[in-house]
Structure formats: C-alpha cells, structure tokens
C-alpha cells in the first residue's frame, strides 16, 4: 500500500526540500556571476522508503525490485518533481545582464 | 569542465539504462496484471560522479555542493530523463482491457 | 480510438506479387508489447493466422507459407507492409491486419478482398 | 500447428434462452504457468472478428455479462446466457499456447 507523504523513517528524515546556503565560490560561479553573492539553494535530499512519494509507475517499480534485488537495483532517489525560476546578475562579453534560471532551484520533491 | 558522457570510473560504471528481467510476481502485479507475464524492465543505474550526464542547472550545483558538504548534500542520482510506453493488459471491474503507461519504462537516463 | 485500414491491389493475376499496406491510428507500434498482424479468410471460410511484427521488430511468419510472406513497418507513418510472393487461386480472400498486445487480438480492419484470376 | 474443432452450426436457439458452442483443441493449451491461451471472437455478418473472451474465462471489457466461458485444457465452452439478436453471427475459437496462432473454423449461431 503507498504511503504517500508519511515517512516510516520518522519526521524529517524522507525525501523533502531542503535550504542549503551557498556562496559563489561554493558553486563555482564567482568568475560569471555578480549577483547574488550568496544563494539560498533548495534541493532534494532523503530517503525514499518504499512507495514514499513515488514519482509514478517506475518508480513503484523500482521500489519492488529494489526490495528483491538490493545489490542490483537501487531504491528510488529523492529529486526534483519542479522547479523555481531564479534571477542570475552576471558578466558577458558585451557587459552585466540578467539571466533567468528555470532548472536551478528545487520547488517539490519526488522519489524516481 | 563537463566530461559529458565520458565516465572516470570506468566503463558501465556510470549512469546509463540497464534491463532487469522481472515477473509480475516480482512487480506485485499478479493480482491485476494478466500479460505480459514478464516484463524487461530498463531502469538507470549507476554512479553520477562530477558533471557526468548533469541534467541541468540543479545538478551541477549538486555536484559543487556534495563536494564541499558531502555528508548534507548527496551526489546527483541517476534517473530517466524519458520513457518508453508499454501497454498491460489488465483485469478492471468491467472485464479485460489494454492500458497504456507512459511512465513505466525508462528510455534514457541523466543525473540530478 | 483504434481504427486500422487495409489497402490492396483488389485482383491480381497469378504468379503477381500481392502488397498489402495496413495504416492504422489510436496507437503506436513503438510501444513496448504492441504488434501488428496479418489474417486472412477465404470467402465462407475460416481465418488463417499469416504474420505478424512486434514493436522491437521481431517478426514471425507462418512457416506453411514464409517462404512468400514479407512483413515490414513504418513507424513513423503509422503503417504494416505485407509481400506475399507469386500468388495463385488459392490466396484469393479476404486479408485482416489487426492490432497485437502480447497474446491480446482486440482490433482488427475492416478487411480488404483478392480475387485471383488469370 | 494446434487444430482447432468446432461444429459448423449450434443448435437453433430462441431468443431469450441460453446457448452453448464448444471447442476442441488437438493438444491441451494450459501453460505451465496456469493460464489456458485460449480465445473466444464473434464476427457478426459483414463486419471483422472482435473478441469476447481472453485467456479462456476473462470477458473482454465492454462484452455484455451474458457471455461466459469456462472449460479444461483441451474442451472448451462458450455460453450465452440470454440470446439476443445482436450475438448472431460466427463463433470462433482460437488458441495462442504455440505459434502461428490458429482459429476453429468456426460456429454460426442460428436463431429458430
């Protein structure tokens, strides 16, 4: 039976959102970007038990096949089911222009 | 720099469709599932190691991010970037029918 | 909603060459467990199982004639191809393509006639 | 190939009343797996084969409930519960245990 959002794990420890700080020398973009200098970086992490916010149908595959053949394939991974579009200030060739980002923050979170 | 589809870890290491021949027993389908009675399931396996297949944006701040907190920030995963339809034939309250699922089998993999 | 056609030269002469297309809609021969197959019915008779072509593009002929039969697919377009080589009297009938998932036969054409006469 | 027997005509039916039409196989078409591969179509006058029952005894979905089939691996039965004019046509069984799949020759149904 799926059990949705309820983590076995106990609270917290399941695939959900998370807030990582970052600085531009963290991710490697202080020769590209001048703004922001520090970004609040949602991302994905935790555990995805069995049928925990399971993606879709391969993902419940997975999750089966996992239990029977754990050395061979692996459990679902906690990744983004979305994203927030994000504001990037940096340099070109012709100067500084704003770039918008759809990939780079997580929004929700799935197991796949 | 991307290092693409080229893996540091030798080759089939990385990230990249495998087939994992499973039963509707082993699915736990057999109670609505009548055919296929096997299925060659292609799902992504594998290591996501720096850049390798990043799926965008997200997963190259990932990479930055497990490098520099790896015990908070995981690696990349390997998932399906697309799939594959299969059809199922399946037992329904009305008598048998043919379903499609557009989300069962993975037809090629990324990292994120 | 599955529909398939056939289409077909209608009469031939014998020792012709019959080509048969099948164009169908409502569904994809690049869908894993999908195929497409070949019967045919002679006038006031029973149906004869001829070929047929799976997704992956395995194909199986029915051995008392695959020595005639070539079965082929367009993907793309959504189309079935059948040869049968050097057709005589006893071809003539009335020729079915109908859509496979596994062992489920559940959509066939409306059928297309050969009459073969010298 | 697998042959498949059916007489050519059932006995006169009256509408409203129940009616039979058997089939036999040369060889018994239950796989190991349990399931019989055999198959039940009606092609009513002027029109195409259509299916009515699925792997012996599993109604096609849409098939009106006054259609059932039962039988052993070899003997087979197809029963109409209560006639009406629209099941007139020819019965056909067919077996997929072995290939080229092959069909009975089929029944008519014949009302009085």
């Known amino acids: 039976a799926r059990n949705g959002d309820h983590c076995p794990l106990g609270p917290g420890r399941c695939c959900r959102l998370h807030t990582v700080r970052a600085s531009l020398e963290d991710l490697g973009w202080a020769d590209w970007v001048l703004s922001p200098r520090e970004v609040q970086v949602t991302m994905c992490i935790g555990a995805c038990p069995s049928q925990f916010r399971a993606a879709n149908m391969h993902a419940q595959i997975k999750t089966s096949l996992h239990r029977l053949k754990p050395d061979t394939v692996p459990a679902p991974c906690c990744v983004p089911a979305s994203y927030n579009p994000m504001v990037l200030i940096q340099k070109t060739d012709t100067g500084v222009s704003l770039q918008t980002y759809d990939d780079l923050l997580a929004k929700d979170c799935h197991c796949i | 720099a991307r290092n693409g589809d080229h893996c540091p870890l030798g080759p089939g290491r990385c990230c990249r469709l495998h087939t994992v021949r499973a039963s509707l027993e082993d699915l736990g389908w057999a109670d609505w599932v009548l055919s296929p009675r096997e299925v060659q399931v292609t799902m992504c396996i594998g290591a996501c190691p720096s850049q390798f297949r990043a799926a965008n944006m997200h997963a190259q701040i990932k990479t930055s991010l497990h490098r520099l907190k790896p015990d908070t920030v995981p690696a990349p995963c390997c998932v399906p970037a697309s799939y594959n339809p299969m059809v199922l034939i399946q037992k329904t309250d009305t008598g048998v029918s043919l379903q499609t699922y557009d989300d069962l089998l993975a037809k090629d993999c990324h990292c994120i | 909603q599955v529909t398939l056609k056939e289409s077909g030269p209608g009469i031939l002469q014998p020792s012709q060459t019959l080509s048969l297309t099948c164009s169908f809609s409502g569904f994809s021969l690049s869908t894993y467990g999908i195929g497409v197959g070949w019967i045919r019915q002679p006038s006031g008779k029973g149906l004869e199982w001829l070929a047929h072509i799976w997704w992956n593009d395995n194909k199986y002929y029915n051995t008392a004639l695959k020595s005639r039969l070539t079965i082929s697919k367009d993907t793309s377009n959504n189309q079935v191809f059948l040869k049968i080589a050097s057709v005589d009297t006893a071809d003539t009938a009335t020729y079915y393509c109908?859509?496979?998932?596994?062992?489920?036969?559940?959509?066939w054409g409306q059928g297309t006639t050969l009459t073969v006469s010298s | 190939d697998i042959v498949m027997t059916q007489a050519a005509f059932s006995n006169p039916v009256t509408l409203g009343t129940s009616a039979s039409i058997s089939c036999r196989s040369s060889?018994?078409?239950?796989?190991?797996?349990?399931?019989?591969?055999l198959y039940w179509y009606l092609q009513k006058p002027g029109q195409s084969p259509q299916l009515l029952i699925y792997q012996m005894s599993n109604l096609v979905s849409g098939v009106p409930d006054r259609f059932s089939s039962s039988g052993s691996g070899t003997d087979f039965t197809l029963r109409i519960s209560r006639v009406e004019a629209e099941d007139v046509g020819v019965y056909y069984c067919?077996?997929?245990?072995?290939?080229?799949?092959?069909f009975g020759a089929g029944t008519k149904l014949e009302l009085k």
């Open positions: 109908a859509r496979l998932a596994y062992d489920y036969v559940d959509s």
């Open positions: 060889k018994s078409l239950l796989h190991s797996n349990g399931i019989t591969y």
């Open positions: 067919a077996q997929n245990l072995e290939l080229p799949p092959t």
